[in-house]
Amino acid sequence: GNLTVAVVLPLANTSYPWSWARVGPAVELALAQVKARPDLLPGWTVRTVLGSSENALGVCSDTAAPLAAVDLKWEHNPAVFLGPGCVYAAAPVGRFTAHWRVPLLTAGAPALGFGVKDEYALTTRAGPSYAKLGDFVAALHRRLGWERQALMLYAYRPGDEEHCFFLVEGLFMRVRDRLNITVDHLEFAEDDLSHYTRLLRTMPRKGRVIYICSSPDAFRTLMLLALEAGLCGEDYVFFHLDIFGQSLQGGQGPAPRRPWERGDGQDVSARQAFQAAKIITYKDPDNPEYLEFLKQLKHLAYEQFNFTMEDGLVNTIPASFHDGLLLYIQAVTETLAHGGTVTDGENITQRMWNRSFQGVTGYLKIDSSGDRETDFSLWDMDPENGAFRVVLNYNGTSQELVAVSGRKLNWPLGYPPPDIPKCGFDNEDPACNQDHLSTLE
């Protein structure tokens, strides 16, 4: 028989982690493995048909993606949809596929909303999702005794798909679910310095544990301004939500592992400011299969897609598409063995959910709602050389923090700052009120 996989991803624009130039080679490698393994879909042929999720400008589109999906559905009647990755593109497609009872598999669509499976029935996320970041942050807060207050700042940049809004939404909602904690959130425009000034005025009244989603440059600017304003001392900690680790990469940008460095005359101050900073990224898989997979992926991307893949955490996305597709094919194989058909979307999907799988990204666990348990890394600065290093990983499957370093985190005071100042945000603690009036008894 024939099994058709309908791909709805950006076909021209290569900048997305889920661009076809990146995911295509991963799909090729997965299908090559299916052919090579007699236990997977014996006697079946798997073919891919392509539709673009981008508009004429090469930008993810909530119009182009569902139109492409509808075309693919009527022309090819696919057994499964692969993608989209962009939130606004995936939303309408996911609603259509739910209505059609066709499984949708993606390693994108990380926003909180896709976890609502009555709306996005049969959507499986084999990649990371933002609510899972909230699980990590909640675990971190519990260990550090931060169970009262946090502040989340997110940047708005025209044309960036509101990545930071969705990231902070997932984090915010999950942290509030997991902990009985007050969380404030503030948006700022990256290109408007007056917004930064306003944030710095608000910060002291709203939090000491601060999460910031922004570009590396905006984060550095904020840290420099915070230092200037006296907010970078021992009382504050700033977490840069830099999930793909852009700020930690070399190349055209900052030197590897030194996110404060630009060579612009402000490096000394920036390094000092970054003493109060930690960086949160996805965890880079460290299993040997992943390194081997990346070699093949890069080779194939260059040979067949004329695309040069850079190193970095973005490669975990194509790798997750690869693993997700293999997991799907495994589920189809089992469904067929039990007398089902490739069009039995519900049955196939149920076989993928609440399941573990050993893939190129390592041990992969899809939870009972069809979302992958996600691993994260916490990076901290070595005060000796100013370089950032992974000090802690979060294992999403076991929900455990794992100490990667034998060195203590770099806390200026030697211990984590409290999440609420000693006297409260407005000096409201009566114990701190110096005007004690004696009473006559």
Partner: antibody, heavy 120, light 107 residues
Framework: EVQLVESGGGLVQPGGSLRLSCAAS????????MSWVRQAPGKGLEWVST????????YYADSVKGRFTISNDNSKNTLYLQMNSLRAEDTAVYYC?????????????WGQGTLVTVSS | AIQMTQSPSSLSASVGDRVTITCRAS??????LGWYQQKPGKAPELLIY???RLPSGVPLRFSGSGSGTDFTLTISSLQPEDVATYYC?????????FGPGTKVDIK
């Protein structure tokens, strides 16, 4: 309740080997770095070795480097110290202790110790 | 390696006395210093971390201060159960190093 229980100590000849174990309970083992600290009879404390929870990073005192190997097994919540080419000056009570990299608590909990005697 | 020195090496004081032990590092270690109490025949116990922080359960008569190279452990009112040897530890950098210890007993 946090508990660390060392075992594996005993009498060994110079040049011989010994493997110490430390069974941990009452905390998430992999979330902490773990260390060995020793104390020669009538002397002060000496840090010996530390391993990260993931097992990826290890650190040794110069006096034991190349002879001792620290390791952990997170599935068993157990810390080990493989001691080779033992010398008389390695005679000591060996303690395991957990090291909290997150909160700055350094060696918060200690085991009761196990005595290693190196003598012919 | 960072050297740690402690003074005095031993002291005798009366119950209720204020006792001060100092620890000096051969180079700056910020506040990455802990104090440990070891009673005869027992394992050491953490008394102070990050130079001045008390773990829960440690009596408030113990306090720590200092930063950089010079540190102090103070027992505000010595009690009979405080008879022990006190060690400082730098965990700023590997190899970690302990001070030689200060033996405290009751006059």
């Amino acid at each position: 309740e946090v508990q660390l229980v060392e075992s594996g100590g005993g009498l060994v000849q110079p040049g011989g080997s010994l493997r110490l174990s430390c069974a941990a309970s009452g905390f998430t083992f992999s979330s902490y770095a773990m260390s060995w600290v020793r104390q020669a009879p009538g002397k002060g404390l000496e840090w010996v070795s530390t391993i990260s929870g993931s097992g990826t990073n290890t650190y040794y005192a110069d006096s034991v480097k190349g002879r001792f190997t620290i390791s952990n097994d997170n599935s068993k919540n157990t810390l080990y110290l493989q001691m080779n080419s033992l010398r008389a000056e390695d005679t000591a009570v060996y303690y395991c202790a957990n090291y909290d990299i997150l909160t700055g608590h350094s060696f918060e909990y200690w085991g009761q110790g196990t005595l290693v005697t190196v003598s012919s | 390696a960072i050297q740690m020195t402690q003074s005095p090496s031993s002291l005798s004081a009366s119950v209720g006395d204020r006792v001060t032990i100092t620890c000096r590092a051969s180079q700056g270690i910020r506040n990455d210093l802990g104090w440990y109490q070891q009673k005869p025949g027992k394992a050491p116990e953490l008394l102070i971390y990050a130079a001045s922080r008390l773990p829960s359960g440690v009596p408030l008569r113990f306090s720590g201060s200092g930063s950089g190279t010079d540190f102090t452990l103070t027992i505000s009112s010595l009690q009979p159960e405080d008879v022990a040897t006190y060690y400082c530890l730098q965990d700023y950098n590997y190899p970690f190093t302990f001070g030689p210890g200060t033996k405290v007993d009751i006059k």
